[in-house]
Interface confidence: low
């Protein structure tokens, strides 16, 4: 025997209290698949969360973060404060990177400058709070007749790493 509930489409639930007829999901709830015996409560985007997509009878609301914050976690389950390049987020808010470290994004932690000497190279461009050092050829490579230095590639757009 076929389960009568299997005929209930998304956006409805199989109402056991009413002879298993398909009832529409109540306001602020949804069912994204057919044959459901209950509808799920819609997610509410409040506080620092903003509504990116309204809840419908067949799909949950989707949230993103208010300006100055970015999403973390599956489905934007958390919002984390943005900082400027050259800073990292601490418990007391955004703090400048310490000398010898940098952060070229609006999120994440300050990372140490590359140690050029470990690769037998010299520092071609000094590091800043926002940018890593650029390593150049070792001093021996800069002797007369050596090939010219290739300029560093432009820095990528910050703050666009995948979620």
């Amino acid at each position: 025997l076929q389960d009568p509930c299997s005929n209930c489409p998304a956006g409805t639930f199989c109402d056991n209290n009413r002879n298993q007829i398909c009832s529409p999901c109540p306001p602020n709830s949804f069912s994204s698949a057919g044959g459901q015996r209950t509808c799920d409560i819609c997610r509410q985007c409040k506080g620092v969360f903003r509504t990116r997509k309204e809840c419908s009878s067949t799909s949950n609301a989707e949230c993103d973060c208010t300006p100055g914050f970015h999403c973390l976690g599956a489905g934007c389950s958390m919002c984390e404060q943005d900082c400027k390049q050259g800073q990292e987020l601490t418990k007391k808010g955004c703090k400048d990177c310490c000398f010898g470290t940098f952060n070229d994004q609006k999120r994440g932690i300050c990372r140490p400058w590359t140690n050029c000497s470990l690769d037998g190279k010299s520092v071609l461009v000094n590091g800043t709070k926002e940018r890593d050092v650029v390593c150049g050829p070792s001093p021996a490579d800069l002797s007369p007749g050596a090939s010219s230095v290739t300029p560093p590639a432009p820095a990528r757009e910050p703050g666009h790493s995948p979620q």
């Epitope: 506080g47 620092v48 973390l72 976690g73 389950s77 958390m78 919002c79 984390e80 404060q81 990292e88 987020l89 601490t90 418990k91 994440g108 932690i109 300050c110």
Partner: nanobody, 122 residues
Framework: EVQLVESGGGLVKPGGSLRLSCAAS????????MSWFRQAPGKGLEWVSH????????DYADSVKDRFTISRDNARNSLYLQMNSLRAEDTAVYYC???????????????WGQGTLVTVSS
């Protein structure tokens, strides 16, 4: 389900006082740092203060230091912000938020209340 509900906002004259409350439910309140943020009209969110789970570690933004006092009552699952010597520039929606510290340099404010409006005006 984690819930944070602020209350205590209202209209107050400059120099006056207000006490905000944040009632928490749905999680082990005493395990978490809690923060107050505020958002003035047309401006971004500003961190105001936070307090550790046990209440032993407290810090404030420079803009409110010596005027605001954060506290908590873990038995009542409640967070408070006592605001004295209020100024017009303290006018904002005040939010409480749960902090989830996951790794150095990353503070996730993973749950927020709906906010309570504080208006300081003569």
């Amino acid at each position: 389900e984690v819930q944070l509900v602020e209350s205590g906002g209202g209209l107050v004259k400059p120099g006056g006082s207000l006490r905000l409350s944040c009632a928490a439910s749905g999680f082990a309140f005493s395990d978490y740092y809690m923060s107050w943020f505020r958002q003035a009209p047309g401006k971004g969110l500003e961190w105001v203060s936070h307090i550790s789970g046990s209440g032993t570690t407290i810090d404030y933004a420079d803009s409110v230091k010596d005027r605001f006092t954060i506290s908590r009552d873990n038995a009542r699952n409640s967070l408070y912000l006592q605001m004295n010597s209020l100024r017009a520039e303290d006018t904002a929606v005040y939010y409480c938020a749960r902090e989830d510290i996951r790794m150095p340099g990353t503070t996730d404010f993973d749950h927020w209340g709906q906010g309570t409006l504080v208006t300081v005006s003569s």
